[in-house]
């Protein structure tokens, strides 16, 4: 991952805004603050992005290398099965859940985990790089 222009002048990564990090054709924002799931989603939308939707195992592995033990909200919910916010199913990883009321998804360096959507966690936004 390559940090945005505020932190880096390298020629290969000038195309993400301040506060964002570049990987491939996308920019990622890792929050410092904590919010519940819906407020995290709204934060991302207000920054013209989406709560993180992971496309494959390679992207997930790369992001997990960057994460700590702390869980971050992603754009994943259990609506008659675990689906990303764009409606696509989670099909490349399992998600760990302890309870039926844990219907929102979060990620840390080790796993995808279900959580109650009211819990305040950090979050990750993703958008196509300019």
């Amino acid at each position: 991952l390559c940090q945005g222009s505020k932190y880096s002048t390298c020629a290969s990564c000038p195309s993400c805004p301040d506060h964002w990090m570049k990987y491939g054709n996308h920019c990622y924002y890792f929050s410092v603050e904590k919010k519940d799931w819906i407020s995290s989603l709204e934060f991302c939308l207000a920054r013209d992005s989406h709560l993180l939707m992971i496309t494959d195992k390679q992207e997930m592995s790369l992001l997990q290398d960057f994460l700590s033990e702390a869980f971050h909200w992603v754009g994943l919910r259990n609506n008659s099965g675990w689906r990303w916010e764009d409606g696509s199913p989670l099909n490349f990883s399992r998600i760990y859940s302890n309870s039926l009321v844990q219907t929102c998804g979060a990620i840390n360096k080790n796993s995808l985990q279900a959580s109650s959507c009211e819990v305040s966690l950090q979050w990750v936004c993703k958008k196509v790089s300019p």
Partner: antibody, heavy 119, light 107 residues
């Protein structure tokens, strides 16, 4: 220095319409989500609308959905609030607010513009 | 939404006195709380963000703290310009909600 200057308030009859404006300066307007917050005559503060950096996304509390519309013109550094089907409970001071980038809510506020809904 | 109960609604104090204002959240909001100051002319300024971080230019006599779901704004030694209105704001959960305000008056 960050400055937010609201205008367009006034007296309007119930059921009427009004458009508020906010002119921003001292920062790169297109890089910030913006909001409107109102303060009732009883001094209660209420968030009423938020718009994304580009203007492609907006968000409202349930009590104003369908009556208030937030928009922006990044070329002019302007934020707007179109108010329609106004009710007496919309009487308030309306503040234009910049959203803190890190998600820590509202970091800069305008001086406000007053809206009175009365027959 | 989350209810923010602010107390007291008004407070009389003397110059140089130490005072604390409190906001109680109806459920956990972590550190996602700001304190705002409103002057008599209506202008609003953020004093503290994320429970305890001071905005730039805010005097060090202002401080913020948390105990569970209770959040406090403390002014260590009141000056004349501090006798205005104060509000808390939670931003952990949508919709953002405000406390009812505290009017700080000079005794």
């Amino acid at each position: 220095e960050v400055q937010l200057v609201e205008s367009g308030g006034g007296l309007v009859k119930p059921g009427g319409s009004l458009k508020l404006s906010c002119t921003a300066s001292g920062f790169t307007f297109r890089n910030y989500a913006m909001s409107w917050v109102r303060q009732t005559p009883e001094k209660r503060l209420e968030w009423v609308a938020t718009i994304s950096e580009s203007g492609n996304y907006n968000n409202y509390p349930d009590n104003v959905k369908g009556r208030l519309t937030i928009s922006r013109d990044n070329a002019k550094n302007n934020l707007y609030l179109q108010m329609s089907l106004l009710k007496s409970e919309d009487t308030a001071m309306y503040y234009c607010v910049r959203d803190d980038w890190e998600g820590r809510a509202m970091d800069y506020w305008g001086q406000g513009t007053s809206v009175t809904v009365s027959s | 939404g989350i209810q923010m109960t602010q107390s007291p609604s008004s407070l009389s104090a003397s110059l140089g006195e130490r005072v604390s204002l409190t906001c109680r959240a109806s459920r956990d909001i972590g550190s996602s709380l700001n304190w705002l100051q409103q002057k008599p002319d209506g202008t609003i300024k953020r004093l503290i963000y994320a429970t305890s971080s001071l905005d730039s230019g805010v005097p060090k006599r202002f401080s913020g703290s948390r105990s569970g779901t209770d959040y406090s704004l403390t002014i260590s030694s009141l000056e004349s310009e501090d006798f205005v209105d104060y509000f808390c704001l939670q931003y952990a959960s949508s919709p953002w909600t405000f406390g009812g305000g505290t009017k700080l008056e000079i005794k």
